[in-house]
């Protein structure tokens, strides 16, 4: 079968040909200093496409709390502080990795999952469809 | 110590009270249909705070390719298509989980890592500091 080269001292797995399960150390190395989106900036309030942050919580997932952005308006805020509907507020999405407990409630067994989250909003020129 | 309720049939770990290492199934469940940021939308070009996407690549990480947004301008694009420096283009950042091989080159042993990535840009009103 197809083998993956292994260093001496590496943990074994049940199937070296096509590893389905790996060991993951949860002592997270954090390259960042601030993890709270509300504390890290007030862009969500100052943006011309402002957004609210909603708490998406799932105790069977890691991280259990994810903040989801919801644009406040369909349009964008103009210089007068009014909503300009000639422009559009749209969510910026990012695909992220999470760990989901599987089977549920098992503390040491997880599955990798990819989910799409809205991180914030930006103001874009609309795509105008002209009718012939 | 604090114990986590366990289902019968859960894998054992060396410390059920405070699991440092867990088993992770790599059959990734993908709740999304489109994973490419350039293909998923053209917001990066249509935004009043447009950005470029730069490839952040690390073969020893999963995901190995992450797209990073860099705002094109300090200011924002106005209705005339010019840069208005009375407004600011700023990056929207998101903390994401990645997996890194540890020890290096071991195929089945990994560590979770948190990194901060810029997902896109938004246009904000600047904070003006008045000098007395």
């Amino acid at each position: 079968g197809i083998t993956i080269p292994r260093n001496p001292g590496c943990p074994n797995s049940e199937d070296k040909n096509f590893p389905r399960t790996v060991m993951v150390n949860l002592n997270i190395h954090n390259r960042n200093t601030n993890t709270n989106p509300k504390r890290s900036s007030d862009y969500y309030n100052r943006s011309t496409s402002p957004w609210n942050l909603h708490r998406n919580e799932d105790p069977e997932r890691y991280p259990s709390v994810i903040w989801e952005a919801k644009c406040r308006h369909l349009g964008c805020i103009n210089a007068d502080g009014n909503v300009d509907y000639h422009m559009n507020s749209v969510p910026i999405q990012q695909e992220i990795l999470v760990l989901r407990r599987e089977p549920p409630h098992c503390p040491n067994s997880f599955r990798l999952e990819k989910i799409l989250v809205s991180v914030g909003c930006t103001c874009v020129t609309p795509i105008v469809h002209h009718v012939a | 110590g604090i114990t986590i309720p366990r289902n019968p049939g859960c894998p054992n770990s060396e410390d059920k009270n405070f699991p440092r290492t867990v088993m992770v199934n790599l059959n990734i469940h993908n709740r999304n249909t489109n994973t490419n940021p350039k293909r998923s939308s053209d917001y990066y070009n249509r935004s009043t705070s447009p950005w470029n996407l730069h490839r952040n690549e690390d073969p020893e990480r999963y995901p190995s390719v992450i797209w990073e947004a860099k705002c094109r301008h300090l200011g924002c694009i106005n209705a005339d298509g010019n840069v208005d420096y009375h407004m600011n283009s700023v990056p929207i950042q998101q903390e994401i989980l990645v997996l890194r091989r540890e020890p290096p080159h071991c195929p089945n042993s990994f560590r979770l890592e948190k990194i901060l990535v810029s997902v896109g840009c938004t246009c904000v009103t600047p904070i003006v500091h008045h000098v007395a």
């Epitope: 096509f18 590893p19 | 790599l26 073969p59 999963y62 995901p63």
Partner: nanobody, 118 residues
Framework: QVQLVESGGGLVQPGGSLRLSCAAS????????MSWVRQAPGKGLEWVAK????????DYVDSVKGRFTISRDNAKNSLFLQMNSLRAEDTAVYYC???????????WGQGTLVTVSS
């Protein structure tokens, strides 16, 4: 964006040969193990072959050993699979894949269909 585009598939008689190619872009091709994976009609994915970054190590699933040869050209960001002595059971969609650190595909192409039939 990461792109893998396979070509070279087609209809061939048992005992015949085909050479599959894969054009890669959007990542540093020479930094990754690359592989060919196939999916026969109604079956799951099956590893065919994989090759190390510099081409110094190659590995094959038992059923293709001695018949298939994987190779790469890092200067041209290309992966190849030379398939000789083809059999009916080699009929499948063949995918070019970029390996992740897990030793499983992180990205793959749309695939190219190989049909072995008389």
């Amino acid at each position: 964006q990461v792109q893998l585009v396979e070509s070279g598939g087609g209809l061939v008689q048992p005992g015949g040969s085909l050479r599959l190619s894969c054009a890669a872009s959007g990542f540093t091709f020479s930094s990754y193990w690359m592989s060919w994976v196939r999916q026969a009609p109604g079956k799951g994915l099956e590893w065919v072959a994989k090759i190390k970054q510099d081409g110094s190590e190659k590995d094959y699933v038992d059923s293709v050993k001695g018949r298939f040869t994987i190779s790469r050209d890092n200067a041209k960001n290309s992966l190849f699979l030379q398939m000789n002595s083809l059999r009916a059971e080699d009929t499948a969609v063949y995918y070019c894949a970029r390996e992740s650190i897990f030793g499983i595909p992180e990205d793959w192409g749309q695939g190219t269909l190989v049909t072995v039939s008389s």
